[in-house]
């Protein structure tokens, strides 16, 4: 017997659908109407035939009351080839829902997204996460998607992007965006970061995550942030192969005084990098390759320092006294 494609948990909270059949029975998804969290995985299907069955240009207001009644707050859609027109149709309908967080993963968006009609209302998302989503429109995809969203977006995550740089002149400002996560774009690099951080389009950024993005030095990142006028409070540069030394010919970069938390864990560092901010609330240097203790001018002034998992702290090292240089915590690095 074929397993049911959709499963709703006992609390009617989470519903997961895996449509792996070539001709799936999409009506099975109706059992998810009572769920708060919904995940729909389409098994890599091409949803082009759907366009023939639905009127993408129909006025979504006719569904408004039904959609408003849905409990869904978090929706994940994955593994499909989706015509842009169909995506737009879904966004128009969802604009009447109470959806707050939308995740799109492993999608191929085909065709171009039409402009937002004057009478249409944008989707009031607080969080939008994209992972491995490709767009036929290349660099202008964010601007096209943005017009279908209300300006209150707080969290934007773009991973494994095929084009992590945006066409900045078309992108409008994200006035409420406090968290931007560009992690898992290993080809981004510091120059790509400059292109992705469209100047003055992210005025409210507080948290910037750049894990596994091909960053090379903290100073290079500092320069990219300064060029874009982005002043995060928290910056995550973990899981990059960082160089500790700065190119002597490169100009010194002054970190924004707003930055108070810096994650440099899993960065392959053999020494504390030069050119860090002078004062930080949090500095994470765990799981690097530091083979000696830092000397006083090698660390910024830090309230909360994490060094666990570095060779110089490894238990069994001869220590001058109990507790010296040893946190007693051995993380799995």
């Amino acid at each position: 017997t074929t397993p049911e494609p959709c499963e709703l948990d006992d609390e009617d909270f989470r519903c997961v659908c895996n449509f792996s059949e070539p001709q799936p029975d999409w009506s099975e998804a109706f059992q998810c109407v009572s769920a708060v969290e919904v995940e729909i995985h389409a098994g890599g299907l091409n949803l082009e035939p759907f366009l023939k069955r639905v009127d993408a240009d129909a006025d979504p207001r006719q569904y408004a009351d039904t959609v408003k009644a849905l409990r869904v707050r978090r929706l994940t859609v994955g593994a499909a080839q989706v015509p842009a027109q169909l995506l737009v149709g879904a966004l128009r309908v969802l604009a009447y829902s109470r959806l707050k967080e939308l995740t799109l993963e492993d999608l191929k968006i085909t065709g171009t997204m039409p402009p937002l009609p004057l009478e249409a209302t944008g989707l009031a998302l607080s969080s939008l996460r994209l992972r491995n989503v490709s767009w036929a429109t290349g660099r202008s995809w964010l601007a096209e998607l943005q017009q279908w969203l209300k300006p209150g977006l707080k969290v934007l995550s773009i991973a494994q992007a095929h084009s992590p740089a945006f066409s900045c002149e078309q992108v409008r400002a994200f006035p409420a965006l406090t968290s931007l996560d560009l992690s898992d774009n290993p080809g981004l690099g510091e120059r790509g970061l400059m292109a992705a951080l469209c100047p003055h389009k992210f005025p409210a950024i507080q948290n910037l995550a750049l894990r596994n993005t091909g960053m090379e030095t903290p100073t290079g990142v500092c320069a990219a942030l300064a060029a874009a006028g982005v002043q995060p409070h928290s910056l995550d540069l973990s899981h990059n192969s960082l160089r500790a030394t700065v190119n002597p010919s490169a100009p010194r970069c002054m970190w924004s005084s707003a930055l108070n938390s810096l994650n440099l864990s899993f960065a392959g560092l053999e020494q504390v990098p030069k050119g860090l901010p002078a004062k930080l609330r949090v500095l994470d240097l765990s799981c690097n390759r530091l083979n000696r203790a830092p000397q006083p001018d090698e660390l910024p002034e830090v309230d909360n320092l994490t060094l666990d998992g570095n060779p110089f702290l490894v238990p069994g090292t001869a220590l001058p006294h109990e507790g010296s240089m040893n946190s007693g915590v051995v993380p799995a690095c």
């Epitope: 000696r292 000397q295 240089m325």
Partner: antibody
Framework: QIQLVQSGPELKKPGESVKISCKAS????????MNWVKQAPGNGLKWMGW????????TYADDFKQRFVFSLETSASTAYLQINNLNIEDTATYFC??????????????????WGPGTMVTVSS | DIVMTQSPTSISISVGERVTMNCKAS??????VDWYQQKTGQSPKLLIY???NRYTGVPDRFTGSGSGTDFTFTISNMQAVDLAVYYC??????????FGGGTKLELK
């Protein structure tokens, strides 16, 4: 075992210079910063500053920025303190002391765990 | 720079008694205070680091406490070998570091 051995006592005239040494043994010299501390006769301890043994970069306390020079001879695991243009107020015992880093669940710092025996410098006309 | 004020400057004490001395920082130093013992004609020795941590080999009659601006060092059962000058030092995470003026322990 860890030892810091300092050079012997010095008697100097005002205006002269003195260079005292601190030879470290029993540990990797470049893994620990070296500090200098002054103690005038009958007085307390005064931290003069420190030198990064990796880079050779010195840092001086405010009262010791003019005539005082910290230096290293890394190959000999030796730190030096030179005082130029000596005056009577420089009469004191000068200690070298190693800064050891400690770290325990988010908290860190340095303390002086090994000290040299001190070098007495007397400045008298 | 942070000023460390030690009190009293000297204490007369008998063997077996409990002795307490204080150190006040001119600004908040968290728990970044160390205590050193210096006997006549010798170099100082580390007793307590980070306000309350006893260094290796230091007898448990020596204890330290405090945080912020007020710190205390106690010898619970004074021995003749403890006669010395005791110094506090603020070792805030970045220099400059500063010593207190010292407290001299004398026999009654």
């Amino acid at each position: 075992q860890i030892q810091l051995v300092q050079s012997g006592p010095e008697l100097k005239k005002p205006g002269e210079s003195v260079k005292i040494s601190c030879k470290a043994s029993g540990y990797t010299f470049t893994d620990y910063a070296m500090n200098w501390v002054k103690q005038a006769p009958g007085n307390g301890l005064k931290w003069m500053g420190w030198i990064n043994t990796q880079t050779g970069k010195p840092t001086y306390a405010d009262d010791f920025k003019q005539r005082f020079v910290f230096s290293l001879e890394t190959s000999a695991s030796t730190a030096y303190l030179q005082i130029n243009n000596l005056n009577i107020e420089d009469t004191a015992t000068y200690f070298c002391t190693r800064s050891t880093f400690y770290y325990s669940s988010y908290i860190y710092g340095w303390y002086f765990d090994f000290w040299g025996p001190g070098t007495m410098v007397t400045v008298s006309s | 720079d942070i000023v460390m004020t030690q009190s009293p400057t000297s204490i007369s004490i008998s063997v077996g008694e409990r002795v307490t001395m204080n150190c006040k920082a001119s600004q908040n130093v968290g728990s970044n205070v160390d205590w050193y013992q210096q006997k006549t004609g010798q170099s100082p020795k580390l007793l307590i680091y980070k306000a309350s941590n006893r260094y290796t080999g230091v007898p448990d009659r020596f204890t330290g406490s405090g945080s912020g601006t007020d710190f205390t060092f106690t010898i619970s059962n004074m021995q003749a070998v403890d006669l010395a000058v005791y110094y506090c030092m603020q070792s805030n995470t970045n220099p400059p570091w500063t010593f207190g003026g010292g407290t001299k322990l004398e026999l009654k």
